[in-house]
């Protein structure tokens, strides 16, 4: 599993890539299987996670088969394993947030 480091207060971008270079359905979950973010057509959908208004993606990348999860204003408690589900595959990224 990929490990990403982030600093408290910063923004981090977790990557998720599909083999198809086109916009398809994806969603990100945390280790508790709570949905964070996904898509319906050209639109974002958000789940009930604590990240909610700090979570985003980049629609301009979707049609290239890239479905990033952007987390803004990182908090220590955001440290977790994040799972991207796309094309019946799962990609796991471990995020470690450190303070100064």
């Amino acid at each position: 599993k990929k490990v990403v480091l982030g600093k408290k207060g910063d923004t981090v971008e977790l990557t998720c890539t599909a083999s198809q270079k086109k916009s398809i359905q994806f969603h990100w979950k945390n280790s508790n299987q709570i949905k964070i973010l996904g898509n319906q057509g050209s639109f974002l959908t958000k789940g009930p996670s604590k990240l909610n208004d700090r979570a985003d993606s980049r629609r301009s990348l979707w049609d290239q088969g890239n479905f990033p999860l952007i987390i803004k204003n990182l908090k220590i408690e955001d440290s977790d394993t994040y799972i991207c589900e796309v094309e019946d595959q799962k990609e796991e990224v471990q995020l470690l947030v450190f303070g100064l």
């Epitope: 319906q40 959908t45 208004d53 985003d56």
Partner: antibody, heavy 121, light 108 residues
Amino acid sequence: QVQLVHSGAEVKKPGASVKVSCKASGYTFTSYDINWVRQATGQGLEWMGWVNPNSGNTGSTQKFQGRVTMTRNTSISTAYMELSSLRSEDTAVYYCARGVLKGDYYYMDVWGKGTTVTVSS
Amino acid sequence: EIVMTQSPATLSLSPGERATLSCRASQSISSTYLSWYQQKPGQAPRLLIYGSSTRATGIPARFSGSGSGTDFTLTISSLQPEDFAVYYCQQDDHLPLTFGGGTKVEIK
């Protein structure tokens, strides 16, 4: 020029269904979403949902799920919005609007003139 | 869903004056996902601004948008007679898309 042309006004009885059409011209119909937005007299705008003319994929707000069907006919560049189980509160002007995804931005840049639907017994 | 609240409901101003319209989201949204529309009586809405601050094609420079987080503003620097209308903000941060209740700019 780019335009969206609606079907004519409709008067329906409560419980009936209405199907509104929106014919696109001046651009490639399958390259942009069609959104549906309604407006009751003297009220604000209410987004209902969208159809992607290329894939046929649709989505609607929870408020209308089970009551609204959004379809398209690519051969005649026309989108349709059908609303069933009509009630008096559905009396409104129904607009179609072209949805543009430009980079990370999404906006509705071209609107039809709207179809007035009146629900009355 | 995100609730968009616009204020004031009505703004009474004279031609040439500056108009400042406010739009508040019930939760923080990215400025990427905020648009403004103008609607005149008997007409369909017209796109003015997208991405919080980018003017749509053909929109005069007197219209400008700003803001971030939960607070967004549409400013009309010098009102022209054709600017008296209702203005709506709209978010597409996530589904469902939602509009504000509108601000009517009327002639004083």
